[in-house]
């Protein structure tokens, strides 16, 4: 049974060339959170965070990726085409796979701003 | 290349007990969950155990917690799968699988061992 | 328990026909459906995962979709090495479950 859900940053945005946090937080289980992937919209994927081995940064993303906070991603140096979805999937036992839903918009703008409220896509 | 080997499969009275294994070549071992999935003579597939890549964390479905433990040693890249109390139902093809190391599917299987269970 | 029921269980086409195999979960499972190939004397083959995504290695007249509870592998332009039996397998939450099997015959 999957009673848990998954709160994120929703949609942010940030200044092209700054940084920006990915955060998504699992709550309402008690499930045993063994594996969190970071995504992009068209699949391919970030980092991994495993519970055991720890952080996995794929090497495409070496460069510009940061494992953490916690569970989330920093993703560093944006350009225009770091604009899209991001999507946080926790693994977990015995529940299974949840997945949250951020929407990045880079901005060129300097009055850009980084919007950190939670909420539940 | 990835390969996974089963072994120890064979005719087992109903009530006992056999301890298969699966020798993992090709990859890094430790950085892998790996799940067992048999087979019935009906051709149906039955997700039986899983275990996180350093053995801490291990999962197995209702039909067969108590009777089947899922276990590895990183040292010689092999998986266990213990099973007491079979039944006849238990007769199968089993079959190792290393899941993709985002945990999406199970990305490679072995040629599977084949157990009986019948008196 | 997530029920997937799979169709057809038998299915007979030529070579260079497109075809189809569903399968659909007693509830949703989000995106998280695998498509697996088995044939006699080879290892079971992963064709797509996450519903749609293609596993590196696998050509292209593979594809998948759906989401939800309802899914659709497709093979276009079939080849002699396609026929084989087909299973699906829902990812998204435990115990794993999956479809009953398609076996794709030559016609």
């Known amino acids: 049974m999957m009673t848990g859900t998954i709160e994120t940053t929703g949609n942010i945005s940030a200044k092209k060339g700054g940084s920006v946090i990915l955060q998504c937080h699992l709550s309402s289980t008690m499930a045993q959170v063994t594996q969190v992937n970071w995504e992009q919209h068209d699949h391919s994927l970030l980092a991994i965070r495993n519970a055991e081995l720890g952080w996995h940064i794929y090497p495409a993303f070496k460069d510009r990726v940061a494992p953490g906070p916690g569970l989330g991603l920093t993703l560093q140096s944006l350009t225009m085409n770091d604009t899209g979805e991001y999507f946080c999937t926790y693994h977990t036992y015995p529940d299974g796979t949840y997945r949250g839903r951020i929407f990045l918009e880079v901005l060129e703008s300097s009055v850009a701003e980084h919007s950190a409220r939670f909420q539940i896509p | 290349e990835v390969q996974l080997v089963e072994s120890g499969g064979g005719l087992v009275k109903p009530g006992g007990s056999l301890k298969l294994s699966c020798a993992a070549s090709?990859?890094?071992?430790?950085?892998?969950?790996m799940s067992w999935v048999r087979q019935s003579p009906e051709k149906r597939l039955e997700w039986v155990a899983e275990?996180?890549?350093?053995?801490?964390?291990?999962y197995h479905p209702d039909t067969v917690t108590g009777r089947f433990t899922i276990s590895r040693d990183n040292a010689k890249n092999t998986l266990y799968l213990e099973m007491s109390s079979l039944r006849s139902e238990d007769t199968a093809m089993y079959y190792c699988?290393?899941?993709?190391?985002?945990?999406?599917?199970?990305?490679?299987w072995g040629q599977g061992t084949s157990v009986t269970v019948s008196s | 328990d997530v029920q997937i029921t799979q169709s057809p269980s038998y299915l007979a086409a030529s070579p260079g026909e497109t075809i189809t195999i569903n399968c659909r979960a007693s509830?949703?499972?989000?995106?998280?459906l695998a498509w697996y190939q088995e044939k006699p004397g080879k290892t079971n083959k992963l064709l797509i995962y996450?519903?749609?995504t293609l596993q590196s290695g696998i050509p292209s007249r593979f594809s998948g979709s759906g989401s939800g509870t309802d899914f659709t592998l497709t093979i276009s332009s079939l080849e002699p090495e396609d026929f084989a039996m087909y299973y699906c397998?829902?990812?998204?939450?435990?115990?794993?479950?999956f479809g009953g099997g398609t076996k794709l015959e030559i016609k």
């Open positions: 699988a290393r899941k993709r190391r985002d945990y999406y599917a199970m990305d490679y």
């Open positions: 090709g990859f890094t071992f430790s950085n892998y969950a």
């Open positions: 275990i996180s890549g350093g053995g801490s964390y291990t």
């Open positions: 509830k949703s499972i989000s995106k998280y």
């Open positions: 996450s519903g749609s």
């Open positions: 397998q829902q990812h998204n939450e435990y115990p794993w479950t």
